[in-house]
């Protein structure tokens, strides 16, 4: 058993049929010695008396808010949560496996630049009685500070018969060094509590591996005289690291016909302009990627050819 | 050239070669969703490689103030990786084929280090750790880790030379 926060405790249980469970001793936080009784949740049934209560925790029915009283007055509470371990593996019932970039990916994180700011998100089908808390650090043995905000519900989607809820959190490294080569990964730890079930999820990454620039901005077309060619120009996104002579991007320019089956013409360039042939009803799209490190491409910025 | 006396390197040449190094490092070990070998023993295998750290003066301001500290650090790293790529980690089984990108990487690391430090000048270099894995699978795992960390190192070096070529070239 360990303390998650004040008066909230997590009991770790091996979860299998007829498992013996864990013996837990609760102590009433009071100077009183006599006349103390214990109850669980809203029930008035007295579970025991005395300053300590010994219970055998085997299932969710044994978890909940234990309260000690004296003469009708509440003295203190202890909330017991369960953390299940099945076949040596901690349960992952609360969050959905996003399966990208690999199986057992529950947390996904992205950064728009090298400033040390990043966003993580996760998915669940649970709509109520759900709380999250997020901690992060750079490295684990001698951790350096990363400050995370509160997790918030950021999107709701209908997937078949189910509703899916996306939660996200923003974090910022306290002393970020954008130009350095990272040697220790960022660690993100999410505590999830649904009713009386506790689970924790972790992710470990370098900022450089989760970089995904915003799309290029100000995408413009300038027709070239007496030609089907156009000059496409764009700018670095505002959110990208500066100076751009140091934090450089590379770009992919694509001409795409109306039908998805039509052949796509692609050009790669380090410049912020390119000359392409504009076909009727086609659109021109541009996306960006770090020039020197193959992290994710941005989403496309697009303009119609006409 | 970035000689210890403090004259400037051939920024544009360094920029071109460092960008080629980035391309080669990624062709040698492309980004895949996951590794096919278990990523065991992460720490001890690559924590000895030289990293370009915050105080090494490789940020835009540090380069403007005095690029020598940063160039020396990059040179150290280039020599270190050049030795690793020439060691039995890469020469043992499974053998590199004649057209292996590792061979081109090795030559380019050497080329860039020579651009930074001409014959007759010496910056101190870091010892390479004595890692000689006996099993092919250990060797593969170590190669991937070295190539991954090389990708990160050459990305920073390429940024330095791109910025230098754009702002510090005579």
């Amino acid at each position: 058993i360990w303390e998650l926060k004040k008066d909230v405790y997590v009991v770790e249980l091996d979860w299998y049929p007829d498992a013996p469970g864990e013996m837990v001793v609760l102590t009433c936080d009071t100077p009183e010695e006599d006349g103390i009784t214990w109850t669980l949740d809203q029930s008035s049934e007295v579970l025991g008396s005395g300053k300590t209560l010994t219970i055998q925790v085997k299932e969710f029915g044994d978890a909940g808010q234990y309260t000690c009283h004296k003469g009708g007055e509440v003295l203190s509470h202890s909330l017991l949560l369960l953390h299940k371990k099945e076949d040596g593996i901690w349960s992952t019932d609360i969050l959905k496996d996003q399966k990208e970039p690999k199986n057992k990916t529950f947390l996904r994180c992205e950064a728009k630049n090298y400033s040390g700011r990043f966003t993580c998100w996760w998915l669940t089908t649970i709509s109520t009685d759900l709380t999250f808390s997020v901690k992060s650090s750079r490295g684990s043995s001698d951790p350096q500070g990363v400050t995370c905000g509160a997790a918030t519900l950021s999107a709701e989607r209908v997937r078949g018969d189910n509703k899916e809820y996306e939660y996200s959190v923003e974090c910022q490294e306290d002393s970020a060094c954008p130009a350095a080569e990272e040697s220790l990964p960022i660690e993100v730890m999410v505590d999830a509590v649904h009713k009386l079930k506790y689970e924790n999820y972790t992710s470990s990454f370098f900022i450089r591996d989760i970089i995904k620039p915003d799309p290029p901005k100000n995408l413009q077309l300038k027709p070239l005289k007496n030609s089907r060619q156009v000059e496409v120009s764009w700018e670095y996104p505002d959110t990208w690291s500066t100076p751009h002579s140091y934090f450089s991007l590379t770009f992919c320019v694509q001409v795409q016909g109306k039908s998805k089956r039509e052949k796509k013409d692609r050009v790669f360039t380090d410049k912020t302009s390119a000359t392409v042939i504009c076909r009727k009803n086609a659109s021109i799209s541009v996306r960006a990627q770090d020039r020197y490190y193959s992290s994710s491409w941005s989403e496309w910025a697009s303009v119609p050819c006409s | 050239r970035a000689v210890p006396g403090g004259s400037s390197p051939a920024w544009t040449q360094c920029q071109q070669l460092s960008q080629k190094l980035c391309t080669l490092a990624w062709s040698a070990h492309p980004l895949v969703g996951h590794m096919d070998l278990r990523e065991e023993g992460d720490e001890e295998t690559t924590n000895d490689v030289p990293h370009i750290q915050c105080g090494d003066g490789c940020d835009p301001q540090g380069l403007r103030d005095n690029s020598q500290f940063c160039l020396q650090r990059i040179h150290q790293g280039l020599i270190f990786y050049e030795k690793l790529l020439g060691s039995d980690i890469f020469t043992g089984e499974p053998s590199l084929l004649p057209d292996s990108p590792v061979g081109q990487l090795h030559a380019s690391l050497l080329g860039l280090s020579q651009l930074l430090q001409p014959e007759g000048h010496h910056w101190e270099t870091q010892q390479i750790p004595s890692l000689s894995p006996s099993q092919p699978w250990q060797r593969l795992l170590l190669r991937f880790k070295i190539l991954r960390s090389l990708q990160a190192f050459v990305a920073v070096a390429a940024r330095v030379f791109a910025h230098g070529a754009a702002t510090l070239s005579p």
Partner: nanobody, 121 residues
């Protein structure tokens, strides 16, 4: 040039067994993935079984429980053990290997010339 050479094909009765071999000209540690594929005239090549470096084999549903893929690192060979053979297993069987990117700049995908399996009573 890296080569893969299949052998062991031939005539087998329904319900019978056959063992195919695929010998590599380089260490099989050189391959990120190795696989067996089969092709019937006029049809597309289909995956039979694959194995990744350090991993365990994956099988097509049609052969699960009947075929076993294994390898011998010392002999630089992968095998396909075919048991309880059915008439629909008749095909040309090809061995494939995908080389690690750091080993070569070209031709990451290597194919053998194929070995024919005929099922007839």
């Amino acid at each position: 040039e890296v080569q893969l050479v299949e052998s062991g094909g031939g005539l087998v009765q329904p319900g019978g067994s056959l063992r195919l071999s695929c010998a590599a000209s380089v260490s099989i540690w050189s391959f990120k993935v190795m696989g067996w594929y089969r092709q019937v005239p006029g049809k597309q090549r289909e995956l039979v079984a694959t194995i990744t470096t350090g991993g365990s084999p994956d099988y097509a549903d049609s052969v699960k429980g009947r075929f076993t893929m294994s390898r011998d690192y010392d002999k630089r060979t992968v095998f396909l053990e075919m048991d309880s053979v059915k008439p629909e297993d008749a095909a040309v069987y090809y061995c494939n290997g995908r080389l690690w990117a750091h080993l070569t700049s070209s031709g990451h995908d290597v194919w053998g010339q194929g070995t024919r399996v005929t099922v007839s009573s």
